[in-house]
Amino acid sequence: AHYNTEILKSIDNEWRKTQCMPREVCIDVGKEFGVATNTFFKPPCVSVYRCGGCCNSEGLQCMNTSTSYLSKTLFEITVPLSQGPKPVTISFANHTSCRCMSKLDVYRQVHSIIRR
Amino acid sequence: AHYNTEILKSIDNEWRKTQCMPREVCIDVGKEFGVATNTFFKPPCVSVYRCGGCCNSEGLQCMNTSTSYLSKTLFEITVPLSQGPKPVTISFANHTSCRCMSKLDVYRQVHSIIRR
């Protein structure tokens, strides 16, 4: 079958935009670290890169293949306010490269980390 | 308390990057439409904009305040392959602007849409 060039171009564009790659996401710091309900962070979220997007098959999963660690400084506020906001430095994993891996490879990778 | 200018700059930067705004997300088309298990799409996902990010308080929610409508063409493939890929057109709402709204405002907005 012959398909319109425009359709093929737009489909190719969609492939590129939705591929498995590091994507900027917002992490809610309080939720991520499960802090006490009277502890708040300002800003409440940080921006980090995590692998995301779609793989070409059900049996594949978008997984990180390399990671760097970032430190970010936020203000921590404890209620009731007995003192002002305290600067705290928190370390976050940043995914720097990703790959569509078979779920079996993912299982192997996780287990090799556990065995280390 | 006096805080280091660098700390304040990086915190301000984090606020900006994590604020409530339209963000590109990948939607798995097959999952979205809950299609038959032998129906596949190429590409499997489309890129759309949805409101996301963090609001400054628990009682606020990041919601869209304006929307535009887009159409994208993909290929549908039915297995076993007795015929070639067929083009399908998907229409959806793209969030074009967002605001942190109180959950009460969100409730009112949803109900005003239902009543229309």
Partner: nanobody, 118 residues
């Protein structure tokens, strides 16, 4: 047990219109997605149109501009308005509904015959 019942099929002349409907009974929840497949004699079942709670709508290019899908959540019903019908639209039309997280997630109707012929 969820059951889907289709209606509205029949014999129509080329250029004519039909409105199919499909109602679900046995569930108090609205399905997340609903849609229509069709199967012509000797051919594979193909997706015609679908709609989701996420605000997405899908049409096969062969029916785009002629068919319109709509849903009524209060009645757990999906409709397919078919205009400017052609001989190649002749098929058995099956509706499906998809509940996220249920088991099974998808339920199917028994099919309704649409014949376009002069």
């Amino acid at each position: 047990e969820v059951q889907l019942v289709e209606s509205g099929g029949g014999l129509v002349q080329p250029g004519g219109s039909l409105r199919l409907s499909c109602a679900a009974s046995g569930s108090s929840f609205s399905p997340y997605a609903m849609g229509w497949y069709r199967q012509a004699p000797g051919k594979q079942r193909e997706l015609v149109s679908a709609t989701s709670e996420g605000g997405f709508t899908l049409y096969a290019d062969s029916v785009k501009g002629r068919f319109t899908i709509s849903r009524d959540n209060s009645k757990n019903t999906v409709y397919l308005q078919m205009n400017s019908l052609r001989a190649e639209d002749t098929a058995v039309y099956y509706c499906y509904m998809h509940w996220r997280g249920s088991d099974p997630e998808n339920y199917w109707g028994q099919g309704t015959q649409v014949t376009v012929s002069s």
